[in-house]
Interface confidence: medium
């Protein structure tokens, strides 16, 4: 048997597997920032440098004596979490620790801020092998630590941090909101949101995934053979980096965006019980619990695509939210959604070379969500194309244009205030492959790809009856692109992606005025990649 | 992910009458200053001055050495802890909160953030 | 009192392999780690590995890494030590012994203490190599 | 691995003397030292674990002392029994032994 930390995160086939890369060497290497570690600890020895750097404020109290196995005690567990003989993920991964928390635990935003100018030094100085970072602190939202977590991903730097322990929105505290970071929660035994004392896990839009991060047994300072049990995001930031430390080494080249994806393509999904975290954040943290992804040799082309929630809007009338995907991910789709349901729709639009999505507010309503369907498309050319509202009682459609460009995803956006004309068409013609069909007073916008071998398709599932959503998924080989609440029953809340199934969300009250012949319809627009074929339609 | 969450941005943007120096009047303050939101999380009296982006790096240590002879001549000692020049342009000080007006009116500042607490999670 | 009773001598080929068995009396198996140690005839005593309950795994010295197999059976309350491509330098006696492991909590915390401090030991199994 | 040497490597006394053995690491292993004792054709007794602690059952003739790199066992006044191989071992990494001191009569 094996801790179960390590079963939950490594399946069975990678158990007795080393990874190397190819030229046989691992040369990835992993830069703690925390308190100071034991180094000659039996589970680290050999395998971590303590450099010289130190930039930690003064201990707090009078009283307050220095013992050494307590000022190592976090650092040494994280540093055996990541490459531990025993206990750790990435077995044998060279780690670099910096000293950035004192022997409380405390550091400053400045200490991170010069701990990270150090990592970028290092790496002008003596260029090497893929970089992790490790962040397993947290302090209240800060720009600047975020803006320097951004340039330092943007070198190809993998930074990896605990989403918090405050049992709140991590999206408050950083580095967690930074979205170049990967942002790891916690989960137990149980594959449960970890509670600590009174607080627990963060959660909401800014956390990626969740990793082991209970009663996890790990290298203890108090002696060089002793372990100890420690919980928190740390622990599961740890894990997550050790993860990517084993994917770097078997693929050196993996970008960001590449892990990013992978992590959240083949991790564990919807074992989490939502409930545990507060009604309005459920919707936006992600129900992932990390696992060890297998090599891109071994699963092909996959198309693979992430959802990415806006900050809210906020509720005045104008109020628009804005989602955007990392620089090398394709936008393919953009949808929105409101509590509500008081919403003027969304678009996507090109803000400084990049594509981003937008969702608009409507009077009266508490504020909406931008949800973007971010993909890792090789050598796409996607362009929008829109209609302006047609007139009263007619439809608009758009369609992609372009020869060998496939439909990846629609957005709808009202000019007009007043929800009540946006019933849907009496008659509603049939749809065409490969076309958004808008309605009374909506532009239209068409997310039109090409790519090497990109074929989509449109999939419709319909409830007349009362029902609070109603799903569609993509089947498997597809994935989920497009979200759409189709022309659809008064009041709709609005579409979103939950891993590969398209939700289209309902107003209670909507439920109730609903005559049977109007069906909420949610609309997905499914594709694949299949690098040997020409990009098509699939009807 | 990426916009500000509970966080204190405070304009500072007033134009200096303080004396008659026509580079820094002409100068009216468009960064901001930010802090953190839990009050027990911050380090009042360090500042982390956030340059442009494009900033060189002699403009850098030009701009920190201009913020030290301006508080000078007000009668404040400032202390340039750091200058940060590999991620972004800028540069780490402890100095009074009263000369935040003064820093926020330097050319090349886009924003200053005051220091504050990170914890072990 | 935990009382180690090992599985009787055996004599074998170059090259071969050999299992010897542990099995524990009086105490909770589980709650404690059992390493083997190897004393050739008039010399010392070699640390070769042991099992760690806290990790569920075990643990090898360097110089019989690749070539030794520490398991055990919680049900039968019973260790394994399995020593593969066997060679007459390892003509010994093979003694298990049951190491310390002590939990406690500091800092609002569980350390588990991996104290390699052998209190009780096995009768000794003696391992003769020979063609 | 820690290197642990042992000295003398025999000694002859009689009893009722005091006898003192030593142990050196090749680092510092805090305390995590412990004595063994051994008979011929017999498993080794712990006597003394973490550099000065007695095991229950050991008559208090025996004592320990040292932390770091440099411990010693002493026996206050030899008796017939405890003429045997002694053996000090470290646990600060994987366990490792000294190459034990015979203590011999007279």
């Known amino acids: 048997s094996i801790p179960w930390n390590l079963e939950r995160i490594i399946p069975a086939w990678h158990q007795t597997e080393e990874d190397r890369s190819p030229d046989g060497s691992s040369q990835v290497e992993v830069y703690l920032l925390d308190t100071s570690i034991q180094g000659a600890h039996r589970e680290i020895e050999g395998r971590v440098t303590i450099t010289d750097f130190n930039s930690v404020p003064e201990e707090d109290g009078t009283r307050f004596h220095r013992q050494a196995s307590k000022c190592d005690s976090h650092g040494t567990h994280l540093a055996g979490v990541v490459s531990g003989r025993d206990a750790g993920v990435a077995k044998g991964t060279s780690l670099h620790s910096l000293r950035v928390l004192n022997c409380q635990g405390k550091g400053t935003v400045s200490g991170t801020l010069i701990g990270l100018e150090f990592i970028r030094k290092s790496q002008l100085i003596q260029p090497s092998g893929p970089l992790v970072v490790l962040l397993p602190l947290a302090g209240g939202y800060s720009r600047i630590l975020n803006a320097a977590c951004r340039h330092l991903a943007r070198t190809g730097v993998v930074l990896v941090a605990a989403a918090g322990n405050f049992r709140d929105d991590a999206c408050l505290y950083s580095p967690a909101s930074a979205p170049e970071v990967i942002t790891v929660g916690a989960t137990n035994a149980q594959d449960q949101p970890v509670t600590l004392g009174t607080l627990g896990t963060n959660f909401g839009r800014c956390v990626d995934l969740f990793a082991p991060g209970k009663d996890i047994i790990g290298a203890s300072s108090d002696c060089s053979t002793c372990f100890m049990s420690q919980s928190g995001t740390s622990q599961a930031a740890a894990h997550v980096a050790g993860i990517v430390a084993r994917m770097l080494s078997r693929e050196p080249t993996l970008t960001l965006a590449e892990l990013r994806q992978r992590l959240i393509h083949f991790s564990t999904k919807d074992v989490i019980n939502m409930a545990w975290f507060p009604e309005d954040q459920q919707v936006l943290t992600p129900n992932l619990v990390a696992t060890l992804p297998p090599s891109t040799h071994e699963t092909g082309g996959q198309l693979l695509c992430r959802t990415v929630w806006s900050a809210h809007s906020g509720p005045t009338r104008t109020a628009t939210a804005t989602a955007r995907c990392a620089p090398e991910e394709e936008l393919l789709s953009c949808s929105s959604f409101s509590r509500s349901g008081r919403r003027r729709g969304d678009w996507i639009e090109a803000i400084g070379g990049q594509q981003v999505c937008k969702a608009l507010n409507a009077f009266g309503g508490e504020g909406v969500y931008a949800v973007a369907r971010c993909c890792l498309v090789p050598r796409a050319n996607c362009s929008i194309h829109n209609t302006p509202a047609a007139r009263a009682g007619l439809e608009t459609h758009v369609h992609c244009h372009q020869k060998d460009h496939v439909l990846t995803g629609c957005s709808f956006h009202w000019e007009v205030e007043d929800l009540s004309v946006r019933r849907q068409p009496a008659l509603r013609s049939r749809r065409q492959p490969g076309q958004c069909v808008g309605h009374q007073a909506a532009s239209v916008y068409a997310s039109c790809c090409h790519a090497p071998g990109l074929e989509c398709k449109i999939k419709e599932h319909g409830i007349s009856g009362p029902s609070e959503q109603v799903t569609v998924a993509c089947e498997a080989g597809w994935t989920l692109t497009g979200c759409n609440v189709l022309p659809g029953a008064s009041l709709t809340l609005g579409a979103y992606s939950v891993d590969n199934l398209c939700v289209a969300r309902v107003h209670d009250t909507a439920r109730a005025d609903r005559t049977s012949g109007e069906a909420t319809v949610a609309a997905a627009i499914c594709c694949r990649s299949r690098p040997s074929a020409k990009a098509s339609w699939v009807q | 992910q990426d916009e500000d969450g509970d966080y204190e941005e405070l304009m500072l943007a007033l134009p200096s009458q303080e004396d008659g120096l026509a580079d820094e009047a002409a100068h009216v303050a468009t960064a901001t200053f930010r802090r953190c939101s839990k009050e027990a999380w911050r380090l009042p009296g360090t500042y982390i001055v956030v340059l442009m982006e494009e900033t060189q790096r002699l403009q850098i240590e030009q701009t920190a050495h201009r913020l030290q002879t301006r508080a000078a001549r007000r009668g404040y000692v400032i202390k340039v802890l750091h200058i940060f020049y590999d991620l972004f342009p800028g540069f780490l000080v402890k100095m009074s909160s009263d000369l935040l007006g003064l820093a926020l009116k330097l050319p090349h500042v886009e924003y200053i953030e005051e220091d504050s607490f990170v914890f072990a999670q | 009192q935990v009382q180690l009773v090992q599985s009787g001598a055996e004599v074998k080929k170059p090259g071969s392999s050999v299992k010897v068995s542990c099995k524990a009396s009086?105490?909770?198996?589980?709650?404690?780690?059992i390493s083997w140690v190897r004393q050739a005839p008039g010399q010392g005593l070699e640390w070769m590995g042991g099992?760690?309950?806290?990790?569920?795994?075990?643990n090898y010295a360097q110089k019989f890494q690749g070539r030794v197999t520490i398991t055990a059976d919680e049900s039968t309350s019973t260790a394994y030590m399995e020593l593969s491509s066997l060679r007459s330098e390892d003509t010994a006696v093979y003694y298990c012994?049951?190491?310390?492991?002590?939990?406690?909590?500091?800092?609002?915390?569980?350390?588990?203490?991996?104290?390699?401090?052998?209190?009780?030991w096995g009768q000794g199994t003696l391992v003769t190599v020979s063609s | 691995d820690i290197q642990m040497t042992q000295s003398p490597s025999s000694l002859s006394a009689s009893v009722g003397d005091r006898v003192t053995i030593t142990c050196r690491a090749s680092?510092?292993?805090?305390?995590?030292l412990n004595w063994y004792q051994q008979k011929p054709g017999k498993a080794p007794k712990l006597l003394i674990y973490?550099?000065?602690t007695l095991q229950s059952g050991v008559p208090s003739r025996f004592s320990g002392s040292g932390s770091g790199t440099d411990f010693t066992l002493t026996i206050s006044s030899l008796q017939p029994e405890d003429f045997a191989v002694y053996y000090c071992?470290?646990?600060?990494?994987?366990?490792?032994f000294g190459q034990g001191t015979k203590v011999e009569i007279k």
């Open positions: 012994a049951r190491h310390y492991e002590i939990q406690i909590g500091r800092y609002g915390m569980n350390v588990y203490y991996l104290m390699y401090r052998f209190a009780s």
């Open positions: 071992q470290q646990f600060d990494g994987d366990p490792t």
């Open positions: 009086g105490g909770t198996f589980n709650s404690h780690a």
């Open positions: 099992i760690n309950p806290i990790l569920g795994i075990a």
């Open positions: 680092q510092g292993i805090r305390s995590a």
């Open positions: 973490n550099g000065s």
